[in-house]
Interface confidence: low
């Protein structure tokens, strides 16, 4: 798996999307976990509803929320009030029994709040509404 980079601004929300094959992963719950070190385990942060049919319902653990579009095949994780300590490697997982398949490896990068920095280039209002993925990390 290649790592996909998602960027968010400190204090704001970041949405991470993990596309998957909806047929292959039919009936499976999903999870979002944080990679502990390069070779370490992936520590569960939040998982979708215990009843797969209710996967569309948003589940939350602290500032992290998860919801699954099982028909469209897209798992969405929202990190609210993004902080520097949220930066790091994560995984979207598909669960079956005690096993977990990696759907996507994710690197979350936290950019400093631009309004904290007073150089001319930092204070301009956005000209268009692209996601943080658009500029630097298309894939």
């Amino acid at each position: 798996h290649n790592t996909t980079v998602f960027q968010g601004v400190e204090g704001q929300s970041l949405q991470v999307s993990c596309p998957y094959d909806s047929m292959k992963h039919w009936g499976r719950r999903k999870a979002w976990c944080r990679q502990l070190g390069e070779k370490g385990p992936c520590q569960r942060v939040v998982s979708t509803h215990n009843l797969w049919l209710l996967s569309f319902l948003r589940r939350r653990n602290g500032s992290t929320a998860i919801t699954d579009d099982t028909l469209g095949g897209t798992l969405t994780i929202t990190l609210r009030n993004l902080q520097p300590h949220d930066a790091g490697f994560y995984q979207c997982q598909s669960l079956h029994g005690s096993e977990a398949d990696t759907l996507r490896k994710v690197l979350v990068e936290v950019l400093a709040d631009p309004l904290d920095h007073r150089d001319a280039g930092d204070l301009w209002v956005p000209g268009e509404s692209e996601s943080f993925e658009d500029a630097h990390v298309e894939h």
Partner: antibody, heavy 123, light 112 residues
Framework: QVQLVQSGAEVKKPGASVKVSCKAS????????MNWVRQAPGQRLEWIGR????????NYAGKFQGRVTITADTSASTAYMELSSLRSEDTAVYYC????????????????WGQGTLVTVSS | DVVMTQSPDSLAVSLGERATINCRSS???????????LHWYQQKPGQSPKLLIY???NRFSGVPDRFSGSGSGTDFTLKISRVEAEDVGVYYC?????????FGQGTKLEIK
Amino acid sequence: QVQLVQSGAEVKKPGASVKVSCKASGYAFSSQWMNWVRQAPGQRLEWIGRIYPGGGDTNYAGKFQGRVTITADTSASTAYMELSSLRSEDTAVYYCARLLRNQPGESYAMDYWGQGTLVTVSS
Amino acid sequence: DVVMTQSPDSLAVSLGERATINCRSSQSLVHSNRYTYLHWYQQKPGQSPKLLIYKVSNRFSGVPDRFSGSGSGTDFTLKISRVEAEDVGVYYCSQSTRVPYTFGQGTKLEIK
């Protein structure tokens, strides 16, 4: 200190391929984007593409799509740029350049450049 | 792709005089995160490019304070307050707001 050392000059025939290497030292290679930029004689700098060595993610300029492959070997802290189906217009100096990501502020500018590799395409 | 256009193409300035280079982009360089990723590079004869200014107006480490950058949106300026002999070379503006990254055609600075 950060250093990017590129492989030596190459002379290739039209239709051939070339692979240029860029060995990085002095920083965490796997967590910084590496860019490839070229400069044909008397021309402006031209961005070819980039790689995120830690995951292998790549982006290429449309002009080079399908003809260029950028790879990285994290164990050797080395990035590679391979260009195929060479033509005379590909004669240029090819540079690797690290993308500066300074917290706070994430500048996304190329702060360190290799010395350049001259690739000459001639029959 | 974002097209970057510099003016003038070349510039001859006396030592100690001020040099001004302009750069215009074909679309706004303001990213949705409110940052403007416009940078300036200097390339001396026979050398690799070097970063001078990043994000419009921030001097890279080791760059003398006679170099300054300004601008917003689509129009940007690099100023050298007192040109020295070592400043001879080609100056490029570049954007990294959108992939593919693009460069201006360059402005050649010479000493009168």
